[in-house]
Amino acid sequence: QRLPRMQEDSPLGGGSSGEDDPLGEEDLPSEEDSPREEDPPGEEDLPGEEDLPGEEDLPEVKPKSEEEGSLKLEDLPTVEAPGDPQEPQNNAHRDKEGDDQSHWRYGGDPPWPRVSPACAGRFQSPVDIRPQLAAFCPALRPLELLGFQLPPLPELRLRNNGHSVQLTLPPGLEMALGPGREYRALQLHLHWGAAGRPGSEHTVEGHRFPAEIHVVHLSTAFARVDEALGRPGGLAVLAAFLEEGPEENSAYEQLLSRLEEIAEEGSETQVPGLDISALLPSDFSRYFQYEGSLTTPPCAQGVIWTVFNQTVMLSAKQLHTLSDTLWGPGDSRLQLNFRATQPLNGRVIEASFPAGVDSSPRAAEPVQLNSCLAAGD
């Protein structure tokens, strides 16, 4: 059953996209560690910065202003129902001017904790996934996605925000991590490397994949992203690794074929609606899950990460298009836009399947050391 949308009162004009651009800023966030093609194994024990206490002092998020009295919601699904507003429902968006959060980049200054103190928190993302250390958790049921099949109209905004390519999703895409753990999708974006250099954010046994997709969701318990930031389970990200395969991926081609139009930083285009679920692996039952953070400033913690065991295949040409088309700040290519893996600091990654026995994207010895924290839920 679809979750009903908020209908009464005035449209909520704020809080927006998520992980790559959670505050709806023109440009969000920088990295304290330069992204590396390959993080050394065991890096999870070596934080990139000193571990400062958590992320309590998050920057305030201001609602976006509305244009011409119209609905200009960034990515929030809780929009006014048709009839009340002065115009039809719409997901045409205007970014507000960048503020303190917007001056960051991958590699070099300023250090991310200076951009947002939460970036020095203890429970950050991404992490290295070691399947044999994951706790098998039978309570983790197959993910449920509803409304991810979109007709061609209305079109969706595809934007080069200088840090990634981001597709803003319309309201109505619902995802459940389990009973009572319901979310609405806000946006998706990608992370990649460069020619011959992989660029996924998460790694498996130290292995970095060519690229990674993130679909960012807001818990239905919150009306706006700024309310959810830093709250446990307030945001959830579905992540999948992209690998090279022999055939062109037709779902991804609908986006990749449009990248030339948004080569310049800050540029955007409109693309026909598509089956968003086709961008993800088909097996929704086998995944890893842990609590982490946004992988870009403000690096807010409490984010539930779900990393699919199954990968998505793109052709070599498609992966090349992804890593070699867009431009970022300062006339530099938009490449290697991934954060170094962060220490687990005692966190246990859960698996919805016996990963240590049967092995994940990268096989390991069949050992299961950790027990499922959610057992009996």
């Epitope: 679809r2 115009e87 039809p88 045409a92 409304g147 099949q149 109209l153 079109e155 609606g273």
Partner: antibody, heavy 118, light 111 residues
Framework: QVQLVQSGGGLVQPGGSLRLSCAAS????????MSWVRQAPGKGLEWVSA????????YYADSVKGRFTISRDNSKNTLYLQMNSLRAEDTAVYYC???????????WGQGTLVTVSS | QSVLTQPPSVSGAPGQRVTISCTGS?????????VHWYQQLPGTAPKLLIY???NRPSGVPDRFSGSKSGTSASLAITGLQAEDEADYYC???????????FGGGTKLAVL
């Protein structure tokens, strides 16, 4: 408030042409995809054509493909349907409508009658 | 023949509950596309009644509700009133036809 005011309907002979207009007001026209839907006398609704907000993408029902052309002039806040090679079966009330976020047709024009007859 | 199948007519007495079904296939409703419902009062343009399967635009009474399951959807009207007498249409998108599709319409008579 949102208003869609249609014009251009009338009587035309088979094989003839007609251009329908839909003048929009009360919202940022260029931000919204638009559609044409028709209803033959005593019959149900039939989707005819659709166009994206920028006008860059257009879609047609098989029954009108190659004969009808949807277009828009965002500077004039107006949607058009150019109908060529008209047939008797094109006789209908034509409605313009706006697409909302969910793909529903949220607002409709008042309709304009097109009669194709000799 | 419409891609989405609706009963040609339904009827009910004032205060009663009626449902209107809308049956599609694996390329439209069954593929996961949203279903929307429209009400067309005699001599007027259609009006959006239910969007995205079960959501009511503001101004639409809560007597109207929608649901969707598998390859079909339904519209329920409770506490039937004389002013509900109208034609009702379901609509979705069909990926095989690459077209937006409507049901044939259902005429509701309030007895």
């Amino acid at each position: 408030q949102v208003q869609l005011v249609q014009s251009g309907g009338g009587l035309v002979q088979p094989g003839g042409s007609l251009r329908l207009s839909c003048a929009a007001s009360g919202f940022t026209f260029s931000s919204y995809a638009m559609s044409w839907v028709r209803q033959a006398p005593g019959k149900g609704l039939e989707w005819v054509s659709a166009i994206s907000g920028s006008g860059g993408s257009t879609y047609y029902a098989d029954s009108v493909k190659g004969r009808f052309t949807i277009s828009r002039d965002n500077s004039k806040n107006t949607l058009y349907l150019q109908m060529n090679s008209l047939r008797a079966e094109d006789t209908a009330v034509y409605y313009c409508a706006t697409y909302g976020d969910y793909g529903s047709l949220d607002y409709w024009g008042q309709g304009t009658l097109v009669t194709v007859s000799s | 023949q419409s891609v989405l199948t609706q009963p040609p007519s339904v009827s009910g007495a004032p205060g009663q509950r009626v449902t209107i079904s809308c049956t599609g296939s694996s390329s439209n409703i069954g593929a996961g596309y949203d279903v929307h419902w429209y009400q067309q009062l005699p001599g007027t343009a259609p009006k959006l009644l239910i969007y995205a399967n079960n959501n009511r635009p503001s101004g639409v009474p809560d007597r109207f509700s929608g649901s969707k399951s598998g390859t079909s959807a339904s519209l329920a009207i409770t506490g039937l009133q004389a002013e509900d007498e109208a034609d009702y249409y379901c609509q979705s998108y069909d990926s095989s036809l690459r077209a937006w599709v409507f049901g044939g319409g259902t005429k509701l008579a309030v007895l």
